[in-house]
């Protein structure tokens, strides 16, 4: 039977009596940073080739033994899961190997640093296919270090590193922390996040997803036919790396945004038991398990959308929050949320010649994430129409009035501390899918898109009174671009996507003694492309 | 993830850029700046990478390196340039005492000196 | 689930030699470091000795060294301390310890056996 | 001799806080990771806090962590008569290259 990892992260449709997908990855190659490795191990022999690469620190220790195996233990491990010929994620993918991890399993930033500049050196003399870099490391949080990954990623190389093994917000490690990377967490055969004794797999915003990272089967270096089974977020994001060989050898011309968005997209959703995640991180943490697509090719017809949660703004006064999306990802929507409930709102704004998304902290506030839906929308022009607060009448109302654009967000801001004492609003009227309604306190901002075959509806779901949490999902076929709550009153916490599900948290009404007037909408806008439908269609 | 105006956790040592008594003094009023890592038992003191200005070319950052070595000599400070960072990133790795950082914060094109630190396999 | 359970405790005449073993469960064994701490009657806690996961590094509290030593069998999941030359002043419960993790062995010591106490008296 | 230094004890009434701070140097406390151990009469010590302030799941978030310079200190808020016991700091000396532990503090709640 095959081992457990290997069946979690396969469709179904590809189950049999061993893991065979269709292309292993034959296009792409697959940089390995980590320690020495075995490379006349049977299971990666002829797979991986040992760069003459190697800047490592001194071992620790005054009687330290320098022992072969030992010292190839990590790496080889890690070249087998992603292209081992009886136990590997990407059988076909070709490897190369870095030595910055010694035989401790230690390194430096400077060594790593030096070998992304070896690859991104070999990536101009000699231009191949396709690269994945998987950096199964980490260390505390690195400036440099995140900006020679954001560099590489930018020449077109996809990064996929560990989140760390040591139950914190991997923001606070890197390469974990870098934007452009993809950071992988760990969850084992029952779906939950991975214990490595008092510690465990990290989590938070700076995780990307997680996938298979204890008890995994995978070459030893004890002997050239041995195996073995280790833990942790390496194991993890060498899964990653190797679906991500498999779907570039597919999709060869993929940018690393598209593939972070199908990442994303074809993983197992809501299957990871949040409760083991600190409460304040649960929000925050993607409960996504990676796994391979149905079919390698024509996911293209997709409307792909992801949610990126900003840094927390801090408790001061006039803190804000900043949301960005990737270069390639448009800024579809932007919400915001505060665990107090005292923010004031949230707009998008343009900085350096892109869109982004920004919350702001009200007085008393402990502080507010802004929450951006970055989506790829090939050939979209996209505007944000604002409407000053309204004051008299009785809400705020912004429409797309450009012919041909359409409603994919809707944000509001207040400069008044607490939209609470103020009367609300009452539900907007329907039949109006290209307008966004909000307080008469506040000013209103409406995301405009054009974009070939893009097209767009509202779906909203009020209770009478807020009782914790509002939902409201898109239907299958539809992708979830917006997600904002009305009315925008004091008891609401805010408004964020979950996967394709808008999510509107309030106060119970139990601790707020709010009256039933106070009605909480979850309004979602839901998008199409039937311009990318038509287009793949076309291709097959 | 994170984010350049994120709400990490470091040391950030900002020093206001002055002439001492350079050719190319950098900019007045821009601020090179001092990372290192948070976790103590990680960080190496004694090895710093000096990131440059995005557009620097590999010969100003070797001219920035010696200019460095030139300077530390003259207080009498022994330094070692590691290793001459292009293609990612310009900037060099450089062996010294931490005492040299204020003057190496002021050198033309630099943006910011981070000390090395440890990473670990996961 | 997680235990360590210590064992070879009791009484020896001083210039003697004892073995202690601690016997792990619920665990991977071999992923983690592993620590033998002592305290003596009314006294704190004194560390012994350190052995990395893999068996590759030792470390020894100067008290102890050069008489003490620490070894492990993964297959066995078995922790020893092998003590030689003892003293009066080694007189002690002895705890073995799990280390917070395998590479990061400084961070301290998460599990902890009951205690086997070694009692070295003429 | 232990190269960390804590009050011998430290008393407050039920409901209180107390804190119990550790003394070191550079070539520990200064940098290198701090945990916190707890005694309770006639058992093994039992992990608090490890990497300065964290703390193990099953530790309540009455018990804190902190780290100022060559210094560190753990605090316990709403005091309970089951807090009585001994707390030891440890951390590795980069010097001695070994672990260390702190003199211990017995806590009494009156």
């Known amino acids: 039977s095959i081992p457990w990892n290997l069946e979690r992260i396969t469709p179904p449709r590809y189950r049999a009596d061993e893991y065979q997908p269709p292309d292993g990855g034959s296009l792409v190659e697959v940089y390995l940073l980590d320690t020495s490795i075995q490379s006349d191990h049977r299971e990666i022999e002829g797979r991986v080739m040992v760069t003459d690469f190697e800047n490592v620190p001194e071992e620790d220790g005054t009687r330290f033994h320098r022992q072969a195996s030992k010292c190839d233990s990590h790496g080889t491990h890690l070249a087998g899961v992603v292209s081992g010929r009886d136990a590997g994620v990407a059988k076909g993918a070709s490897m190369r190997s870095l030595r910055v991890l010694n035989c401790q399993g230690k390194g430096t930033v400077s060594g790593t640093l030096i070998g992304l500049e070896f690859i991104r050196k070999s990536q101009l003399v000699q231009p191949v296919g396709p690269l994945v870099v998987l950096l199964p490391l980490a260390g505390g949080y690195s400036r440099v270090l995140n900006a020679a990954c954001q560099r590489l990623a930018r020449a077109g190389v996809v990064l996929v590193t560990a989140a760390g093994n040591f139950r914190d917000d991997a923001c606070l490690y890197s390469p974990a922390s870098a934007p452009e990377v993809i950071t992988v967490g760990a969850t084992n055969a029952q779906d939950q996040p991975v214990t490595l004794g008092t510690l465990g797999t990290n989590f938070g915003r700076c995780v990307d997803l997680f996938a298979p990272g204890e008890d995994i089967i995978g070459a030893s270096s004890d002997c050239s036919t041995c195996f073995v089974s280790q833990s942790g977020t390496s194991q993890a994001a060498a899964h990653v790396a190797g679906i991500a060989a498999m779907m570039l050898s597919a999709e060869p011309e993929l940018t690393l945004a598209e593939l972070r968005q199908r990442l994303i997209h074809f993983s197992a959703k809501d299957v990871i038991n949040e409760a083991w995640f600190p409460e304040d991180q649960r929000v925050l943490t993607p409960n996504l398990v990676a796994a391979l697509p149905p079919s390698t090719h024509g996911a293209g017809w997709q409307l792909f959308c992801r949610t990126v949660w900003s840094a927390h703004s801090g408790p001061t006064r006039m803190a804000t929050a900043i949301a960005r999306c990737a270069p390639d990802e448009e800024l579809l929507s932007c919400s915001s949320f505060s665990r107090s409930g005292k923010r004031r709102g949230e707009r998008m704004e343009a900085q350096g010649g892109k869109l982004v998304c920004r919350a702001h902290n009200a007085f008393g506030g402990e502080g507010v994430y802004a929450i951006a839906r970055c989506c790829l929308l090939p050939q979209a022009n996209c505007s944000v129409h604002t409407a000053p607060p309204a004051e008299a009448s009785m809400g705020t109302r912004v429409h797309c009035h450009q012919q041909g654009h359409v409603l994919t967000g809707c944000s509001s801001h207040w400069e008044v501390e607490d939209l609470g004492t103020h009367k609300p609003p009452v539900l907007r009227p329907r039949g109006q899918p290209n307008q966004c309604v909000g307080h008469r306190e506040a000013s209103i901002h409406a995301s405009c898109c054009h974009a070939p075959g893009l097209e767009c509806k509202v779906k909203e779901h009020g209770i009478p009174a807020p009782q914790g949490q509002v939902t409201v999902a898109c239907e299958e076929g539809w992708t979830l671009t917006g997600c904002s709550a009305l009315p925008g009153t004091s008891h609401v916490l805010g408004a964020y996507a979950v996967d394709n599900t808008c999510v509107v948290r309030s106060r119970d009404v139990s601790t707020t003694g709010s009256t039933s007037e106070e009605a909480v909408t979850a309004v979602a806008i839901c998008c199409r492309s039937r311009h990318l439908a038509q287009a793949s269609q076309e291709l097959q | 993830q994170e984010d350049e105006d994120g709400d990490y956790e470091e040391l950030v040592l900002a020093l206001r850029s002055e002439e001492d008594g350079l050719a190319e003094a950098p900019e007045h009023g821009t601020t090179a700046t001092f990372h290192r890592c948070a976790k103590d038992p990680w960080r190496l003191p004694g090895t710093y990478v000096v990131v440059l200005k995005e557009e620097t070319h590999l010969s100003q950052s070797e001219r920035t390196a010696r200019r460095l070595q030139a300077q530390a000599a003259r207080r009498g400070y022994l330094t070692k340039i590691l290793h001459v960072f292009h293609g990612l990133l310009p900037g060099f790795l450089v062996k010294m005492s931490g005492d040299l950082l204020e003057l190496a914060l002021k050198l033309p094109h630099v943006d910011y000196i981070e000390e090395d630190s440890s990473v670990f396999a996961q | 689930q997680v235990q360590l359970v210590e064992s070879g405790g009791g009484v020896v005449q001083p210039g003697r030699s004892l073995r202690l073993s601690c016997a792990a469960s619920?665990?991977?064994?071999?992923?983690?470091?592993m620590h033998w701490v002592r305290q003596a009657p009314g006294k704190g806690l004194e560390w012994v000795a350190l052995?990395?996961?893999?068996?590759?590094?030792?470390y020894y509290a100067d008290s102890v060294k050069g008489r003490f030593t620490i070894s492990r069998d993964n297959s066995k999941n078995t922790l020893y301390l092998q003590m030689n030359s003892l003293r009066a002043e080694d007189t002690a419960v002895y705890y073995c310890?799990?280390?917070?993790?395998?590479?990061?062995?400084?961070?301290?010591?998460?599990?902890w056996g009951h205690g086997t106490t070694v009692t070295v008296s003429s | 001799q232990s190269v960390l230094t804590q009050p011998p004890s430290v008393s407050a009434a039920p409901g209180q806080k107390v804190t119990i701070s550790c003394s070191g140097s550079s070539s520990n406390i200064g940098n290198n990771f701090v945990s916190w151990y707890q005694q309770l009469p006639g058992t093994a010590p039992k992990l608090l806090i490890y990497d300065y302030n964290k703390r193990p799941s099953g530790i309540p978030d009455r018990f804190s962590g902190s780290k100022s310079g060559t210094s560190a200190t753990l605090g316990i808020t709403g005091l309970q008569t089951g807090d009585e016991a001994d707390y030891y700091c440890?951390?590795?000396?980069?010097?001695?290259?070994?672990?260390?532990f702190g003199t211990g503090t017995r806590v009494t709640v009156l």
């Open positions: 310890a799990r280390a917070i993790a395998a590479l990061y062995y400084y961070y301290g010591m998460d599990v």
């Open positions: 440890g951390t590795w000396d980069s010097s001695l290259s070994g672990y260390v």
């Open positions: 052995i990395w996961n893999d068996g590759s590094n030792k």
């Open positions: 619920g665990f991977t064994f071999s992923s983690f470091g």
